[in-house]
């Protein structure tokens, strides 16, 4: 007996071939011997089966001795043994229809769990293997669970259902609602304008919610809310903003914030949260601001940085076109009685310059 696997909602062709390539009598019946369809003269006739309105056959293939039955909009309960009677012989085809669905909405927040449930006909014992867009393999039986969704789980999941050495493939589109980056750091010289961008890792037809940026300045004892905003159909509107600093926010996505000036008192780290309508939980993105200041006071040339820097970052002062350099894995470096010329303050990570500031030292006569 031939076994054919089908997908719920899909269309399947059950083949039945006669030895002679000519138009002949044929009938398709179910396991209860109820006629589904057949031929009477040149007419396709339908029987009393509940399948009849979804069953069809291709007249153009009858001349080739092919009397297939096509079943549209498959249901789990269509799983049955179907009998094709042609040329005084009977061909049996066992059809097994499976369905695979996500238990919840397929738009899930990062960190939430995903459960896929397999619908299968009674008496079947299928196995399921799913592969995430990032290449993660998960196996299961009637259910498959992914406890904590990550950004890279967004996309098309491919699940293979196996039964009797046959397979059928399901594709399920999962959207993980998250920002493109978990964290980002902006490096700026004192006085420069700061641009913070928070691109989303997904697109939705309608995007509505509300958000807030909390800021913990390095110099401050507690964090404070810098801005709150609403999002309606991808349009951003500011609800409340602090007076110091007076942030500006873009009206369109991606979420975009502008700080007019980078100042040492603003250096620190922030947490932007976004709560989406009809979703439990919030999206988060951490943002850091590192500010550099180079100053000369009397005989002392100083370079300082404020904000969250890793201990492996190097701060250097060097005289342009000269070998004179002072470097430290610290947040401040200085040179006493510096030579006249253009000095560069550099913040670097393994040789890669993250931030630089130039200061001119004039000769003192």
């Amino acid at each position: 007996k031939k076994v054919v696997l089908g997908k719920k909602g899909d269309t399947v062709e059950l083949t039945c071939n006669a030895s002679q390539k000519k138009n002949t009598q044929f009938h398709w019946k179910n396991s209860n011997q109820i006629k589904i369809l057949g031929i009477q003269g040149l007419f396709l006739t339908k029987g009393p089966s509940k399948l009849s309105d979804r069953a069809d056959s291709r007249k153009s293939l009858w001349d080739q001795g092919c009397f297939s039955m096509i079943i549209k909009n498959l249901k789990i309960e269509d799983s049955d043994t179907y009998i094709c009677e042609v040329e005084n012989k009977k061909e049996e085809v066992e059809l097994l229809v499976f369905g695979l669905t996500a238990n919840s909405d397929t738009h899930l927040l990062e960190g939430q769990s995903l459960t896929l449930t397999l619908e299968s006909p009674p008496g079947s014992s299928p196995s399921v293997k799913c592969r995430s867009p990032g290449g993660k393999n998960i196996q299961g039986g009637r259910t498959i669970s992914v406890p904590q969704l990550e950004r890279q789980d967004s996309g098309t999941w491919t699940c293979t259902v196996s039964q009797d050495q046959k397979t059928v493939e399901f594709k399920i589109d999962i959207v993980v609602l998250a920002f493109q980056k978990a964290s980002s750091t902006v490096y700026k010289k004192e006085g420069e304008q700061v641009e913070f961008s928070f691109p989303l890792a997904f697109t939705l037809e309608k995007l509505t919610g509300s958000g807030e940026l909390w800021w913990q300045a390095e110099r401050a004892s507690s964090s404070k809310s810098w801005i709150t905003f609403d999002l309606k159909n991808k349009e951003v509107s500011v609800k409340r903003v602090t007076q110091d600093p007076k942030l500006q926010m873009g009206k369109k996505l991606p979420l975009h914030l502008t700080l007019p000036q980078a100042l040492p008192q603003y250096a620190g780290s922030g947490n932007l949260t976004l709560a989406l309508e009809a979703k439990t939980g919030k999206l988060h993105q951490e943002v850091n601001l590192v500010v550099m200041r180079a100053t000369q006071f009397q005989e002392n040339l100083t370079c300082e940085v404020w904000g969250p820097t890793s201990p492996k970052l190097t701060l250097s002062l060097k005289l342009e076109n000269k070998g004179a350099t002072v470097s430290k894995q610290a947040k401040a470096v200085w040179v006493l009685n510096p030579e006249a010329g253009m000095w560069q303050c550099l913040l670097s990570d393994s040789g890669q310059v993250l931030l630089e500031s130039n200061i001119k030292v004039v000769p003192t006569w």
């Epitope: 089908g6 997908k7 909602g9 899909d10 269309t11 399947v12 062709e13 003269g41 040149l42 007419f43 069809d56 291709r58 007249k59 153009s60 001349d63 096509i70 079943i71 549209k72």
Partner: antibody
């Protein structure tokens, strides 16, 4: 609701090979046959050929020697290649879904053969 | 190949008129016939299949009849949106063939 979206080169020189692809969105790819049909002012609607998910093909005998229809089930796409084109192959080419009747069609691609 | 011949090749009518288009097959095709409507710059749209069955969403003013070699498409009361070209197609045997079309114009 099934949607068929087709694309391919619109301007060819005589003797070149016409190449078109049709992608199927939002419906079942299995169980159906996927056809190519062309329409020219001179010959009206002309069925070129068809393919199913398994790669089984049927072609119009008048074009069979020049036609190849192939399928990529991983992408729910099927393609048409028509070799050694002449000005007589200038037409609007359509992809369509069929069991016995063409119930869903692509938007059509005008292919012009000119030296 | 089965030849499909439509008549008339064009017809002029007014809104509200009853219009009949015929299609003749060069050999018997039982009821393996479909009717399509095509508007300029668009793909054909299936109206009637199996000679007399309605495709979903098709208005009831369209009807099909016939069997064997002679078939008819009738529009009981013409609407503005019905002015188009109509084609018949046989699904009895390969190669599938179409009629040459009937152009329905506003009088």
């Amino acid at each position: 609701q099934v949607q068929l979206q087709q694309w391919g080169a619109g301007l060819l020189k005589p003797s070149e090979t016409l190449s078109l692809t049709c992608a199927v969105y939002g419906g079942s790819f299995s169980g159906y046959y996927w056809s190519w049909i062309r329409q020219s002012p001179g010959k009206g609607l002309e069925w070129i050929g068809e393919i199913n998910q398994s790669g089984s093909t049927n072609y119009n005998p008048s074009l069979k020697s020049r036609v190849t229809i192939s399928v990529d089930t991983s992408k729910n796409q099927f393609s048409l290649k028509l070799s050694s084109v002449t000005a007589a192959d200038t037409a609007v080419y359509y992809c369509a879904r069929v069991i016995n009747w063409f119930d869903s069609w692509g938007q059509g691609t005008l292919v012009t053969v000119s030296s | 190949d089965i030849q499909m011949t439509q008549s008339p090749s064009s017809v002029s009518a007014s809104v509200g008129d009853r219009v009949t288009i015929t299609c003749r097959a060069s050999q018997g095709i039982s009821s393996w016939l479909a009717w399509y409507q095509q508007k300029p710059g668009k793909a054909p749209k299936l109206l009637i299949y199996a000679a007399s069955s309605f495709q979903s969403g098709v208005p009831s003013r369209f009807s099909g009849s016939g069997s064997g070699t002679d078939f008819t498409l009738t529009i009981s009361s013409l609407q503005t949106e019905d002015f188009a070209t109509y084609y018949c197609q046989q699904a009895n045997s390969f190669p599938y063939t179409f009629g040459q079309g009937t152009r329905l114009e506003i009088k």
